[in-house]
């Protein structure tokens, strides 16, 4: 009957943890004798290729200064005490303790068995490290530049994480990689970049994060701060200003990042009806007369700079009924 | 790089225990098995015995209760209990590779009894 | 007990080549290694795994096994191979460990 080595054509292990590489003989033969078990790494150097070795009566020797014993060993392989104790080699399953990037390669687990001669079979090792992702809004000031808004890093990644955003904004991705401190590991930044403007503050944008160490991608929402000058409106006009009017109010409505500084209401006729009177960022007219027939400017100023918006009034004689009882009812 | 040395070969009237040591250089006794072989003059090698990595000793049939080896985390000795002259022999240390091949020797240490 | 034989000498022209044999009186369960060894020198690793060659052994060196017969083959033999050679193998057949050497071949380049 012919034996195999059952191995797994790839194991996956994390930098600075402990591995398995699973290797049994099967099927359990009667009379088969096992003089031997090697672990070799065949693409290393030639004095480092045996890295491990078990004979059924010497036991476990580890023959490459690298791993070596302290970081190796053998799971299940027991040797042969004396006239009493068969060794038990057919699981030759070895350990593998604090993963080094320098682990990673081919490894292949051999038996030299009698009368059936060598039979092996290889497993690939792969080291991998779980990367740490932060993401951050960066405090841009409006601009008609392209600037980065925000930044997504996954830090230490084996194999080098990928970084994807979400956002319905008009935006680009420039990504850069580097080392990470721990040897073999990557660094991965993403810039979030667009032309910062008042319409993107408060957006929240994603990070998507993927890496084959987690189960599903890590998403990490990021709020963007961008500094613009006020945006402003003005609401309150009904197109039924009328002479005599004494409820009227003009609201100015500001988009702001930082928070207005200061109102200011103005004309451009120059001339400021004294029935109106400015109170922050509302314009209260006690009476409407006939100065109003002009346009109504207000000019707000945050630490970035100004905004304006103007209103034309349009004063009547009496009021416009036209449409009053078709809004009302 | 890794070296082996062999000291304490000189020397002795029969019957006088004989302590010979080997002085390894990078290596870690802790993953090697470590054999003694000695050659006598004019003649073959022939093995003596070993000691594993985990510090189990196995030893030649005709060296049984004649040596004794053991070692420290730098050293690996030899003790000639009661040497007869047939015991006169350059004395090798040697390392066992995966496959159990002695793949690094000392240059030998010289042993003489004589009355 | 496990016994290698080994033809106390043999010689070679130099250039040639020769082949050295090494046979056990039982069929062995373990690999065979190869050592050269020259006057006042520790013996040198040759071969190992019955057909490996360690680093920095020239391949002119080469190693074969059938049986219970371990060859080590010389081509283009050369005046600096004139040296002892022993086969071993280790032998776990009874409840002890043995490491077995061959009686040795006294190689001799002529020529």
């Known amino acids: 009957q012919d034996v195999r080595v059952q191995v797994l054509p790839e194991v996956r292990g994390q930098l600075g943890g402990t591995v398995e590489l699973p290797c049994h003989l099967l099927p359990p033969v009667p009379g088969l004798y096992i003089s031997l078990v090697t672990w070799q790494r065949p693409d290393a150097p030639a004095n480092h290729q045996n890295v491990a070795a078990f004979h059924p009566k010497m036991g476990p020797s580890f023959p490459s200064p690298k791993p070596g014993s302290e970081r190796l060993s053998f799971v299940s392989a027991k040797q042969s005490t004396g006239q009493d104790t068969e060794a038990e080699l057919q699981d030759a399953t070895l350990a593998l303790h604090g993963l080094t990037v320098e682990d990673e390669g081919n490894y292949t687990c051999e038996f030299a068995t009698f009368p059936k001669g060598s039979v092996r079979g290889m497993t690939w090792l792969r080291v991998i490290a779980k990367p740490k992702n932060q993401a951050e809004a960066q405090k841009v000031t409006f601009s008609q530049d392209p600037t980065t808004v925000a930044l997504c890093i996954s830090k230490e990644g084996r194999p080098p994480a990928r970084i994807s955003w979400l956002s319905s904004l008009d935006w680009e991705a420039k990504e850069t990689q580097v080392s990470g401190t721990l040897a073999g590991t990557v660094t991965v930044t993403s810039r979030f970049t667009l032309v910062p403007s008042g319409r993107a503050d408060g957006v929240t944008v994603t990070c998507k994060v993927e890496h084959e160490s987690f189960e599903e991608p890590a998403l990490i929402p990021v709020t963007l701060s961008v500094r613009y000058p006020p945006e402003v409106s003005i609401s309150g006009y009904d197109d039924n200003w009328y002479l005599g009017r004494t409820d009227a109010t003009l609201s100015c409505d500001v988009r702001s990042n930082p928070e207005p500084t200061g109102y200011d209401w103005s004309t451009t006729s120059g001339t400021f009806p004294t029935s109106a009177v400015a109170q922050g960022s509302q314009l209260v007219i006690h009476a409407v007369d006939s100065l109003f027939n002009t346009t109504f400017v207000c000019t707000v100023t945050n630490a970035v700079g100004m905004g304006r918006a103007e209103q034309v009034i349009f004063v009547r004689e009496t009021p416009n009924t036209a449409g009053a009882g078709a809004t009302g009812g | 790089a890794q070296s082996l040395e062999e000291s304490g070969g000189r020397l002795v009237t029969p019957g006088t225990p004989l302590t010979l040591t080997c002085t390894v250089s990078?290596?870690?006794?802790?993953?090697?098995?470590m054999n003694w072989v000695r050659q006598a003059p004019g003649k073959g090698l022939e093995w003596i015995g070993i000691?594993?990595?985990?510090?189990g000793t196995y030893y030649a049939r005709w060296a049984k209760g004649r040596f004794t080896i053991s070692k420290t985390s730098t050293t690996v000795d030899l003790k000639i209990t009661s040497p007869t002259t047939e015991d006169t022999a350059t004395y090798f240390c040697?390392?066992?590779?995966?496959?159990?091949?002695?793949?690094?020797w000392g240059p030998g240490t010289l042993v003489t009894i004589s009355s | 007990s496990f016994v290698l034989t080994q033809p106390a000498s043999v010689q070679v022209n130099l250039g040639q080549t020769v082949s050295l044999t090494c046979t056990a009186d039982?069929?062995?369960?373990?690999?065979a290694s190869w050592y050269q060894q020259k006057p006042g020198q520790a013996p040198v690793l040759l071969i190992y795994?019955?057909?490996s060659r360690p680093s920095g052994v020239p391949d002119r060196f080469s190693g074969s096994s059938s049986g219970n017969t371990a060859t080590l083959t010389i081509s283009g033999a050369q005046a600096g191979d004139e040296a002892d050679y022993y086969c071993?193998?280790?032998?776990?057949?009874?409840?002890?460990?043995?490491?077995?050497f061959g009686g040795g071949t006294q190689l001799t380049v002529t020529g």
């Open positions: 040697a390392r066992s590779g995966g496959s159990m091949q002695l793949n690094l």
């Open positions: 990078g290596i870690d006794l802790s993953s090697y098995h």
């Open positions: 000691i594993g990595a985990s510090a």
């Open positions: 039982t069929l062995s369960r373990s690999y």
């Open positions: 795994r019955d057909t």
């Open positions: 071993a193998t280790d032998d776990s057949s009874g409840s002890s460990y043995q490491y077995v």
